[in-house]
Amino acid sequence: ALDTNYCFRNLEENCCVRPLYIDFRQDLGWKWVHEPKGYYANFCSGPCPYLRSADTTHSTVLGLYNTLNPEASASPCCVPQDLEPLTILYYVGRTPKVEQLSNMVVKSCKCS
Amino acid sequence: ALDTNYCFRNLEENCCVRPLYIDFRQDLGWKWVHEPKGYYANFCSGPCPYLRSADTTHSTVLGLYNTLNPEASASPCCVPQDLEPLTILYYVGRTPKVEQLSNMVVKSCKCS
């Protein structure tokens, strides 16, 4: 699987999950998030050669098409597969609120 | 929606579904598919600016991150959202077989 266990331990050029730390205030301008200051959102990148973690029949077909027609602009793209939530603390006036934001952390990638 | 109804009628630079005809024999080397000869598989391409048909909270966050950090390599990617099946005819020896291949035709795209 193209997950953090594999991708963070290997120098993988093809589609894989990459570490990306986002600081809410500095990188997003989100001053309202009090905790955490930031988090590892991670991201997916790298080429998607034929059959590499193909998401659907279409991505398999497109991968093969791209292999046999290298000049073509159409090819699968490396995108998130498994995502995990992130719990944040913020304030509404003087009242603290805790919320779980879904699909915030990329744990693995796929070619789609 | 970034679907064929919209994308095929507009000159859209950003993420959209694009027409792509694939000939089974010529483009994939699949001699075993007898009908159809080929089909419009289509594909997704184009930049994913902030909030454009964002698939998850992560893609929204990544889009904003990319807007505020233009030099960053991390950005959402334009990939298939809705896919449709394709019915094909092939022969096993002298016996005709009809099969519905799932997720073969891209009907719309999203930023993921």
Epitope: - | K31, H34, E35, L89, Y91, G93, R94, P96, V98
Partner: antibody, heavy 119, light 111 residues
Framework: EVQLLESGGGLVQPGGSLRLSCAAS????????MSWVRQAPGKGLELVAD??????????YYSDSVKDRFTISRDDSKSTLYLQMNSLRAEDTAVYYC??????????WGQGTLVTVSS | DIQLTQSPSSLSASVGDRVTITCRAS??????????MHWYQHKPGKQPKLLIY???NLASGIPSRFSGSGSGTDFTLTISSLQPEDFATYYC?????????FGGGTKVEIK
């Protein structure tokens, strides 16, 4: 260009044998099913024998009229189709065509070879 | 085995005529939306030639005056404007199941 060249036809006495050959070129012979179709004088086309590719275990078919007398075979290394005809009868007199059916239709045909069974 | 019955068995026509040949199968030769019937032209001393495959698809190099239609058990070959070179015998053939069989043929003669 697809070419199918039959040979081996001729005059033979009833009860005799003949071996027809069909040399194929211009296509991937290994991948496709091959057949022998005949036309007897004043009659229509009849599928006599058929053999599919190695992928499908060289499965064969014979019409009832030739079963146990004719044997179809192929040599993929030589791109050649064969029809071994034994115990020939007068009613086997016909033009025999070699043909290739990539799918459900016989797309290409040889020029035919005449087999005459007569005493 | 699936039997194919062609009609008429022979016909006389003139150059420029519209000619229709039918082929009826003893059971359906269609599967899903695919119609597994094919048509051939056969001239004396020549090898048969594929005209139409899967009911309505024109084979490579065949003039557009030839067309095919039908589904299930009933199929038609049409020559929109008969030409001198079209006088021949025409056969239908199915590939719905093994064994594939041919129709008895329709001989198109000059009137």
């Amino acid at each position: 260009e697809v070419q199918l060249l039959e040979s081996g036809g001729g005059l033979v006495q009833p009860g005799g044998s003949l071996r027809l050959s069909c040399a194929a070129s211009g296509f991937d012979f290994n991948s496709y099913g091959m057949s022998w179709v005949r036309q007897a004088p004043g009659k229509g086309l009849e599928l006599v024998a058929d053999i599919v590719s190695k992928t499908y275990n060289y499965t064969t078919y014979y019409s009832d009229s030739v079963k146990d007398r004719f044997t179809i075979s192929r040599d993929d290394s030589k791109s050649t189709l064969y029809l071994q005809m034994n115990s020939l009868r007068a009613e086997d007199t016909a033009v025999y065509y070699c043909t290739v059916a990539p799918g459900g239709s016989f797309d290409y045909w040889g020029q035919g070879t005449l087999v005459t069974v007569s005493s | 085995d699936i039997q194919l019955t062609q009609s008429p068995s022979s016909l006389s026509a003139s150059v420029g005529d519209r000619v229709t040949i039918t082929c009826r199968a003893s059971q359906s030769v269609s599967i899903s939306r695919f119609n597994l019937m094919h048509w051939y032209q056969h001239k004396p001393g020549k090898q048969p030639k594929l005209l139409i495959y899967r009911a309505s698809n024109l084979a490579s190099g065949i003039p557009s005056r030839f067309s095919g239609s039908g589904s299930g058990t009933d199929f038609t070959l049409t020559i929109s404007s008969l030409q001198p070179e079209d006088f021949a015998t025409y056969y239908c053939q199915h590939s719905r199941e093994s064994p594939w069989t041919f129709g008895g043929g329709t001989k198109v003669e000059i009137k």
